[in-house]
């Protein structure tokens, strides 16, 4: 799976979209999880309604919401009041049994609020994040991770 980068501004909302084949994943609940380390587990943040037919209903866990357009085949995650600690690698997942298929790998980048004059030193960006050749604007800026980019900050 390629990684898609979604960028949002600190303090604002970020919408992440994950398209999928609606027939291939028919009847399956979806989830949004956060990758813990490069080879670590993906920790569940929020999942769609327990009843698949009600997947269109928005479910919240803290400041993160999930909703699923099961006919159109688009899973949408909203990160409200984006904070620097929200930056990192995530996955959209399709659940079957107790297993999960990855629909999309997502790198969330948090940009400093240009109107906020406080020190932005605690905002983390993976290397080369200034490169926007492939960016396209949806509800957020998103692009595919470029070759050589690291989805995790280097560990010392």
């Amino acid at each position: 799976h390629n990684t898609t980068v979604f960028q949002g501004v600190a303090g604002q909302s970020l919408q992440v979209s994950c398209p999928y084949d609606s027939m291939k994943h028919w009847g399956r609940r979806k989830a949004w999880c956060r990758q813990l380390g490069e080879k670590g587990p993906c920790q569940r943040v929020v999942s769609t309604h327990n009843l698949w037919l009600l997947s269109f209903l928005r479910r919240w866990n803290g400041s993160t919401a999930i909703t699923d357009d099961t006919l159109g085949g688009t899973l949408t995650i909203t990160l409200r009041n984006l904070q620097p600690h929200d930056a990192g690698l995530y996955q959209c997942q399709s659940l079957h049994g107790s297993e999960a298929d990855t629909l999309r790998k997502v790198l969330v980048e948090v940009l400093a609020d240009p109107l906020d004059h406080r020190d932005a030193g605690d905002l983390w960006f993976p290397g080369e994040s200034e490169s926007f050749e492939d960016a396209h604007v949806e509800h957020s800026i998103s692009r595919s991770l470029l070759e050589g980019e690291i989805p995790f900050p280097p560990t010392s």
């Epitope: 027939m23 009843l51 107790s98």
Partner: antibody
Framework: EVQLVQSGAEVKKPGESLKISCKGS????????IAWVRQMPGKGLEWMGI????????RYSPSFQGQVTISADKSISTAYLQWSSLKASDTAMYFC????????????????WGQGTLVTVSS | DIQMTQSPSSVSASVGDRVTITCRAS??????LAWYQQKPGKAPKLLIY???SLQLGVPSRFSGSGSGTDFTLTISSLQPEDFATYFC?????????FGQGTKLEIK
């Protein structure tokens, strides 16, 4: 009417190759996963693997990974199971089965089965 | 892999009897379990899915229960056409393993 029709019985020698088929009708073939299941003579059922004909996404059981190849051609609504070099121990009945996901369950079950293809490998 | 163990491996019963077959998973599988019936020379037939949901067209004398690791298939009043082999299968993880089967014979 949903139907899965499998190819006929085969008698082969060890080392030979073989490809058996499973043709679906009465439903949108490309939109349902297809599983392959082995049943050796007088024995139980063994799950071999599964394929989504829509994009040929395949999952194998570790026991069968590298031993067989599962493929599909959605344009002719057919799934395949093939061997490059048969062994006597491959002698068995092979079933294909359509996988159905039930909207309140989020897992899949084999709701329609083919009639089976008997493969006999003997020198 | 998840191991599925059925008991008994065979059972003799008469028409009209109530029969219970059990299936135990080597680890918790929630309610992701199916029961199949197979007659000699035929393909298996789905009876129960999601541990307790009756497949369309299957007689109501068949019922399933259980969750986690222990499951049962019950036939409330045996009919002549019910004499067959029954398999459980977990739908929790790949590979989707089956129990070894329970042969239901006429007493």
């Amino acid at each position: 009417e949903v139907q899965l029709v499998q190819s006929g019985a085969e008698v082969k020698k060890p080392g030979e190759s073989l490809k058996i088929s499973c043709k679906g009708s009465g439903y949108s073939f490309g939109s349902y996963w297809i599983a392959w299941v082995r049943q050796m003579p007088g024995k139980g059922l063994e799950w071999m693997g599964i394929i989504y004909p829509g994009d040929s996404d395949v999952r194998y059981s570790p026991s069968f990974q590298g031993q067989v190849t599962i493929s599909a051609d959605k344009s002719i609504s057919t799934a395949y199971l093939q061997w490059s070099s048969l062994k006597a121990s491959d002698t068995a009945m092979y079933f294909c089965a359509r996988q159905r996901t039930f909207y309140y369950d989020s897992s899949d079950y084999s709701d329609y089965w083919g009639q089976g293809t008997l493969v006999t490998v003997s020198s | 892999d998840i191991q599925m163990t059925q008991s008994p491996s065979s059972v003799s019963a008469s028409v009209g009897d109530r029969v219970t077959i059990t299936c135990r998973a080597s680890q918790g599988i929630s309610s992701w379990l199916a029961w199949y019936q197979q007659k000699p020379g035929k393909a298996p037939k789905l009876l129960i899915y999601a541990a307790s949901s009756l497949q369309l067209g299957v007689p109501s004398r068949f019922s399933g229960s259980g969750s986690g690791t222990d499951f049962t298939l019950t036939i409330s009043s045996l009919q002549p056409e019910d004499f067959a082999t029954y398999f459980c299968q977990q739908a929790d993880r790949f590979p989707r393993t089956f129990g070894q089967g329970t042969k239901l014979e006429i007493k």
